[in-house]
């Protein structure tokens, strides 16, 4: 009788992570008597995948009933495949022996390749905010994919970026891979509403790439511009001075009025108006009773924005241009929370 052959008809099998792999194996004879075992890898370090008679293999099922008389189909199914299952699987026939069974013949092997989807890309920006005209770095990471081939692109508001560096690790063979990319982005004053997008394309995604986003509102700081103006006289001896704080982001802002260098009032921006570009405007004003002053008054609007060093703008209020009531200490009417009377 012809000597037994172990036939593994599939040189390779490709399975998506989470699915079931079928590894086919048939024997050409019932002799010699002995079990079939499946291994991953060859040599002394090989891993036992299935032993038909003993051991615990909860992920493995047989395609046919191995105990049926004259059964020569030793194919198996492995459930819930992960990238760690990739490798070459051998169907091996043993001959019963003493003390141990003896390996009789092995199949040629079936290479199991696992396709695994990349994880959702995670985009992270700089730890500290930066101002327009500065260049900031964004990183994008995705893990657990196989095979190694992958494409990563960066976009800012739909426009593809070119200044980035990408690494796929590890360099050599592995059950799964990770990608890490760093992109450089130049900020502009209009970037409060901007988004940076990292897009990952992989064979497992069937042309529907994964995207990770970062909002530049988390990254940008647009410093305010200040303008201090003197309004026309509201009533006799009263002058309205306003400080226009324009085009700032984020909203966190504290304003202090100084009269001749002395703190007059401090307030926090609350009722702000939002511009189309996402920046904010705010206005603070003082009502000054000029009759209380013999000399000119230097009014300073000092703004501390988002914890940065204060910026300021000053305005000289000429009191000589207005009639004075000597010795008057009458206060002007306080008509608003942003008003300040000077005696």
């Amino acid at each position: 009788e012809e000597e037994l052959q172990v036939i593994q008809p599939d040189k390779s099998v490709l399975v998506a992570a989470g699915e079931t792999a079928t590894l086919r194996c048939t024997a050409t004879s019932l002799i010699p008597v002995g079990p079939i075992q499946w291994f991953r890898g060859a040599g002394p370090g090989r891993e036992l995948i299935y032993n038909q008679k003993e051991g615990h293999f909860p992920r493995v099922t047989t395609v046919s009933d191995l105990t049926k008389r004259n059964n020569m189909d030793f194919s198996i199914r492995i459930g819930n495949i992960t990238p760690a299952d990739a490798g070459t699987y051998y169907c091996v026939k043993f001959r019963k022996g003493s003390p141990d069974d003896v390996e009789f013949k092995s199949g040629a092997g079936t290479e199991l390749s696992v396709r695994a989807k990349p994880s959702a890309p995670v985009v992270s920006g700089p730890a500290a905010r930066a101002t327009p005209q500065h260049t900031v770095s964004f990183t994008c990471e995705s893990h657990g994919f196989s095979p190694r081939d992958i494409t990563l692109k960066w976009f800012k508001n739909g426009n593809e970026l070119s200044d980035f560096q990408t690494n796929v690790d590890p360099v050599g063979e592995s059950v799964s891979y990770s990608i890490h990319s760093t992109a450089k982005v130049v900020l502009t004053r209009e970037d409060v509403h901007s988004q940076v997008i990292c897009e990952v394309a992989h064979v497992t995604l069937q042309g529907d790439p994964l995207r990770g986003t970062a909002n530049l509102s988390e990254t940008i700081r647009v410093p305010p511009t200040l303008e201090v103006t003197q309004q026309p006289v509201r009533a006799e001896n009263q002058v309205n001075v306003t400080c226009q704080v324009r085009k700032f982001y984020p909203q966190r802002l504290q304003l202090t009025w100084l009269e001749n260098g002395n703190v007059s009032r401090t307030e926090t921006a609350s009722t702000v108006t939002e511009n189309k570009d996402g920046t904010y405007n705010w206005m603070s004003w003082l009502l000054v009773n000029v009759s209380a002053h013999r000399d000119d008054v230097k009014l300073t609007c000092q703004v501390e924005h988002d914890g940065q060093p204060a910026v300021s703008k000053s305005h000289d209020l000429k009191v000589s241009a207005h009639p004075k009531e000597q010795g008057s200490n009458t206060a002007a009417e306080n008509t608003g929370s942003n008003e300040r009377n000077i005696y």
Partner: antibody, heavy 113, light 108 residues
């Protein structure tokens, strides 16, 4: 559901023979090796041997070789372990197990004169 | 035959502590053939870890197994009251199959 139900406790005199049964359900006994394990009071586990019920092939630990016989009846889905020439140190709980994964509840054998 | 030596014989710890149980083989055992069992008084052993590092069904993730060649370890990251029992390592790489003598994990 896989179940292995062993026969009840036995008290035997030195020199006698004991035969313990292990009736299985939830699987075909021919599909798996059936193992037997000894555990003396307060001691650890000791492998006695196993049978392949499909062809009655057996393997025994050297310590028990010559005194132990493991058999199986595929028609009743039952495995047996027979230990002869009993001595006091054979007093133990004897377990059957299916392919190293599922165990019977144990059978206490007491050897006493 | 392959002799499995477990250490320590007894391990006294408190709930919440980390437990490390060792199993040393007299000759090399393929990781596929190294199993761990848990046994409580009056009960049959239960398969706990198979193929060195795989948890049997229903075993909590605080348990882990590792090792290769001749040195194997069962680790419990944070002991729960129900973990106190005897643990046996077992090899079925070659006949005769053998068990370690067991490590008794007791409450301190």
């Amino acid at each position: 559901e896989v179940q292995l139900v062993q026969s009840g406790a036995e008290v035997k005199k030195p020199g006698a023979t004991v035969k313990i049964s292990c009736k299985v359900s939830g699987f075909n006994i021919k599909d798996y090796y059936m193992h037997w394990v000894q555990q003396a009071p307060g001691k650890g586990l000791e492998w006695i041997g196993r049978i392949d019920p499909e062809d009655a092939e057996t393997k025994y630990a050297p310590k028990f070789q010559g005194r132990v016989t493991i058999t199986a009846d595929t028609s009743t889905n039952t495995a047996y372990m027979e230990l002869s020439s009993l001595r006091s140190e054979d007093t133990a709980v004897y377990y059957c197990d299916r392919g190293l994964a599922y165990w019977g509840q144990g059978t206490l054998v007491t050897v006493s004169s | 035959e392959i002799v499995l030596t477990q250490s320590p014989a007894t391990l006294s710890l408190s709930p919440g502590e980390r437990a490390t149980l060792s199993c040393s083989a007299s000759s090399s055992v393929s990781s596929s053939y190294l199993y761990w069992y848990q046994q409580k008084p009056g009960q049959a052993p239960k398969l706990w870890i198979y193929s060195t590092s795989n948890l049997a069904s229903g075993i909590p993730a605080r348990f882990s197994g590792s090792g290769s060649g001749t040195d194997f370890t069962l680790t419990i990251s944070s002991l729960e009251p129900e973990d106190f029992a005897v643990y046996y390592c077992h090899q079925w790489s070659s006949y005769p199959y053998t068990f370690g003598q067991g490590t008794k994990l007791e409450i301190k």
